[in-house]
């Protein structure tokens, strides 16, 4: 097509509205002023313009604003907000939830592509911390973005946010993960009564240290076989057969499916096999009666 | 004049599916979002969802995710609303209406479509 | 998705007086707003958009108010022909929802 640089006698957009999508390419470039379109941004996507007309009113929009759109031409970008590179989007300085929550709409259902991995990178460092709000959006679009967090960024998210997740957000959570979580958790629901407390902070015992896990036992908890095999090792090891009888309740049964998986292979390897018996089970390979345990942890520290 | 002439009234068992058609005339048909509306008996209006007949491009409500599929025949300039396995819920009269870029300011009769053991 | 709240769900009135209806956006909507009719037996038809503006053929006893999340359609002097269903109706994106409808009849 011939380059052709001046609009038509009579094809100047007054207003953004159906009749552009009738207009070659060279035309919207030609006729479509960039300000009439940052104005009725919320227009465009409604308008059932093809992919190569959106490219043009793109190119309009940045020649427009070549340090960056304002927000309130992000709030309305729509499906525009596909074609977006990271490049384009570490221009902008997003700071509304409202913002945010339309343009993760529009790549709603669909993995977290670079662009909306950037814009969140953006709004949150924008925010400074990742607070309750914040969290209550981005999870219910990606559940699993908790997880996709390293430990040090996760050391940025109050205890105040730790509201907002729900237990399927954890469910990719490594145990390094788990660690930084969990202290935050037990912060937030301290002072929920017993019951209710471990409602809460089941989904976070993956990074609880074995003084809880006992503290717990004490509370007829009954926790579930799914939740005990996410338990750190190092916790559970130290757990008398006692402990976790009381812990799981009339989970208890469970162990014996499980004798041959962590963290129960190596918690009953380290249980004298008169006290597993006590729980008559079967549970087989704890240490043979008469024989002297030494904690080999605790000679290193003295030596 | 701008119309929109949708297909006739359907009784259907539930787990079938049902095809409503609803085709256009006296405007470029590719110019415009199909939208589809249903009114359950007594009820308000939901919105399913709208393609883009320039395209075939399509975004559905979430309720509906999985068990709608519009298409369109640019040739005969008709759209198709299709819902997959239905139940005695989806009992309603199906709307298409035309999307302007401020609202759907011309709708179909409606189709009544009746899901029944 | 965003919630339109309207009230109240009936209205009863007598032809002359004047309607008023509200709608109430769970989030900020901007002006991406409408007001449909609809009568007994009959498909709804647009009767405000962008909030404030009467669609072609709308008398101009019918307005509109509001921006953000509050929103008003007022009916200044009910005719016979206005006793119907109105629903209020946002765009946000391409996320549309409507209002659960409120029912204005003769007293």
């Known amino acids: 097509e011939v380059e052709k640089t001046a609009c038509p006698s009579g094809k100047k957009a007054r207003e953004i509205d159906e009749s552009l999508i009738f207009y070659k390419k060279w035309e919207l470039e030609a006729c479509v002023d960039a300000a009439l379109l940052a104005t009725q941004m919320d227009r465009v996507n409604a308008i059932p313009f093809t992919y190569e007309q959106l490219d043009v009113l793109k190119h309009k929009l940045d020649e427009l604003y070549p340090q960056g759109y304002p927000e309130s031409v992000i709030q309305h970008l729509g499906y525009l907000f596909l074609k977006m590179s990271p490049e384009d989007i570490r221009k902008w300085n997003v700071t509304s939830l409202e913002t945010l929550k339309a343009l993760l709409e529009v790549n709603k259902g669909h993995e977290m592509s670079p662009q909306v991995a950037t814009l969140i990178d953006r709004f949150v460092k924008g925010r400074g911390q990742l607070d309750k709000d914040t969290l209550d959006t981005l999870t219910a679009f990606y559940p699993g973005y908790l997880c996709s967090l390293s430990p040090e960024e996760l050391s940025s998210v109050p205890p105040s946010s730790i509201w907002a997740v729900r237990p399927q957000d954890l469910d990719t959570c490594d145990p390094r993960q788990l660690d930084v979580l969990y202290p935050k958790a037990r912060l937030a629901f301290q002072n929920m009564n017993g019951s209710e407390y471990f409602v809460k902070i089941q989904s976070f015992l993956g990074g609880a240290p074995t003084e809880d896990l006992k503290a717990l036992s004490q509370q007829n908890v009954s926790m579930d076989l799914a939740t005990f095999m996410k338990l750190r090792t190092d916790a559970v090891l130290p757990l008398t057969v006692a402990e976790v009888q009381k812990l799981l309740g009339p989970h208890v049964e469970g162990l014996k499916a499980e004798e041959r998986h962590r963290p129960v292979r190596d918690w009953i390897l380290r249980q004298r096999q008169d006290d597993l018996d006590t729980l008559g089970l079967g549970l087989q390979g704890g240490i043979p009666n008469g024989y002297l345990v030494l904690d080999l942890s605790m000679q290193e520290a003295l030596s | 004049q701008v119309q929109l002439q949708q297909s006739g009234a359907e009784v259907k068992k539930p787990g079938a599916s049902v095809k409503v058609s609803c085709k256009a005339s006296g405007y470029t048909f590719t110019g415009y979002y199909m939208h589809w509306v249903r009114q359950a008996p007594g009820q308000g209006l939901e919105w399913m969802g709208r393609?883009?007949?320039?395209?075939?491009?399509?975004n559905y409500a979430q309720k509906f995710q999985g068990r709608v599929t519009m298409t369109r025949d640019t040739s005969i300039s008709t759209a198709y609303m299709e819902l997959s396995r239905l139940r005695s819920e989806d009992t309603a009269v199906y709307y298409c209406a035309r999307g302007r870029y401020y609202g759907m300011d011309v709708w179909g009769q409606g189709t009544m479509v009746t899901v029944s053991s | 998705e965003i919630v339109l709240t309207q009230s109240p769900a009936t209205l009863s009135l007598s032809p002359g007086e004047r309607a008023t209806i509200s709608c109430r956006a769970s989030q900020s909507v901007s002006s991406n707003f409408a007001w449909y009719q609809q009568r007994p037996g009959q498909a709804p038809r647009l009767l405000i958009y962008d909030a404030s503006n009467r669609a072609t053929g709308i008398p101009p006893r019918f307005s509109g108010s509001g921006s953000g999340t509050d929103f008003t359609l007022t009916i200044s002097s009910l005719e016979p022909e206005d006793f119907a269903a109105y629903y209020c109706h946002q765009r946000s994106n391409w996320l549309y929802t409507f209002g659960q409808g409120t029912k204005v009849d003769i007293k």
């Open positions: 393609i883009n007949p320039n395209s075939g491009g399509t």
